[in-house]
Interface confidence: medium
């Protein structure tokens, strides 16, 4: 006759692993019993479990409740065992040994593998600002045995590197995701991606890449010179920018207090019906955490009783 | 011929212990499996608990939890400590040894009678 096992079996860490010895023997070979023990390399070999044709199964104090025979129906050929809720600490040789009748002592080794799947991490860097070099997006970390894969997903340029740190049972990957921040990268997606043959699929975890800036400010409402003059209704100053966090604004006139009756409403400034004195110089400030911007122009209201035509000048500064 | 004398049986009361010893005669092969079984008056006797070489165990569902087999192997001796004892207990308490040559064979004490009564 002969044992029939396999070399290696790999369970996820958690499960139950079926450690396989089938004794395939001649008509009218019994099995008296069927001895496991865990025999890594080094040790001295420790007795796991003995099945019994009589006495049945016995188990180790060390393994008490978690080794079992397969659910029925059974062969008494069949000298398999179930490894309860494998954990790391299990993974290593286990050797088979089948005492036969007539036929005498048989014995084979296998391999226990116990694949622990990752937990991955993503760290996010520090704060991206426009204007800075290359820097640190995101780190992601995923710790699991064997090594896991750790790669990025993105539409985003960037660099990446990787670093291993090899531990007694499973090793721990750290990447990171490197890029010069633009404000076109706000809002784009940066994922970390961890493959591992212990998940059925890719984990992924998603991180939002927030750029801060301050675009320049400009304003707008004077583009037709010839509508500033007495007694218009419904004027108004509008101030452009764009930003990250976004940007609060704020006006004054650099030549004196705001006119009254002249509306302050976030970027805009409504006047009231248009008089000589809403001529001056207004100047739009435009502010985040990261940065802030002035704009300012000249406004001047015309009389229609006289000739000269309207002059207006625009000017910006950083 | 391998020889087995059990020892360490009594009168004890519901709730108490005991401890059986089973000490076998040196053999030149190694005991395989030791173990215990009991017969109580008019039954047929029954499996109480066995033991391998390694130390692996297997009790009847009736002890377990309350009775725990031990061995010592350089003594070729078994033990049941016996806890929590009821009055379906009382019996003759017999031990068995298993030797591996080119068959297995099955040798038994003489028995110690453990009675449980108030």
């Known amino acids: 006759g002969e044992l029939e096992t396999s070399d290696v079996v790999t369970v996820v860490l958690g499960q139950d692993a079926k450690l396989p010895c089938f004794y395939r023997g001649d008509s009218g070979e019994q099995v008296g019993q069927v001895a496991w023990a865990r025999v890594d390399a080094g040790e001295g070999a420790q007795e796991l479990a003995l099945l019994h044709s009589k006495y049945g199964l016995h188990v180790s104090p060390a393994y008490e409740g978690r080794v079992e025979q397969p659910p029925p129906p059974r062969n008494p050929l069949d000298g398999s065992v179930l490894l309860r809720n494998a954990v790391q600490a299990d993974e290593g040789e286990y050797e088979c040994r089948v005492s036969t009748f007539p036929a005498g002592s048989f014995q084979a080794r296998l391999r226990l593998r116990v694949l622990v799947p990752p937990l991955p991490s993503l760290n996010p860097g520090p704060a991206l600002e426009e204007g800075q070099g290359l820097t640190l997006a995101a780190s992601c970390t995923a710790e699991g045995s064997p090594a896991p894969s750790v790669t990025w997903d993105t539409e985003v340029k960037g660099t990446t590197s990787s670093r291993s740190f090899k531990h007694s049972r499973s090793a721990a990957v750290t990447s990171e995701f490197h890029l010069v921040p633009s404000r076109s990268m706000n809002g784009q997606p940066l994922t970390c991606v961890v493959s591992h043959p212990g998940l059925l699929q890719d984990q992924r975890i998603t991180h939002i890449l927030h750029v801060s800036f301050l675009a320049e400010a400009s304003v707008r409402g004077l583009e037709d010179q010839n509508l500033w003059h007495i007694g218009r209704e419904g004027a108004m100053l509008k101030c452009l920018s764009e930003g990250q966090p976004p940007p609060s604004y704020n006006w004054t006139r650099l030549d004196g207090p705001l006119p009254s009756g002249v509306r302050v409403d976030g970027d805009t400034l409504g006047f009231p019906p248009l008089t000589t004195e809403h001529s001056g110089i207004y100047v739009c400030h435009v502010s985040n955490e990261f940065s802030s911007r002035d704009s300012q122009v000249t406004v001047d209201v015309l009389d229609p009783q006289e000739d000269s035509g309207k002059q207006v000048d625009l000017v910006s500064a950083s | 011929e391998v020889q087995l004398v059990e020892s360490g049986g009594g009168l004890v009361q519901p709730g108490g212990s005991l401890r059986l010893s089973c000490a076998a005669s040196?053999?030149?092969?190694?005991?395989?499996?030791m173990g215990w079984y009991r017969q109580a008056p008019g039954k047929q006797r029954e499996y109480v608990a066995t033991i391998t070489t390694g130390g692996s165990t297997n009790y009847a569902d009736s002890v377990r939890g309350r009775f725990t087999i031990s061995r010592d192997n350089a003594e070729d001796t078994v033990y049941l400590q016996m806890n929590s004892l009821r009055a379906e207990d009382t019996a003759v308490y017999y031990c068995?040894?298993?030797?591996?040559?080119?068959?297995?064979?099955?040798?038994w004490g003489r028995g110690t009678q453990v009675t449980v009564s108030s």
């Open positions: 040196r053999s030149t092969f190694s005991l395989n499996i």
């Open positions: 068995t040894a298993e030797l591996v040559r080119r068959g297995p064979t099955t040798y």
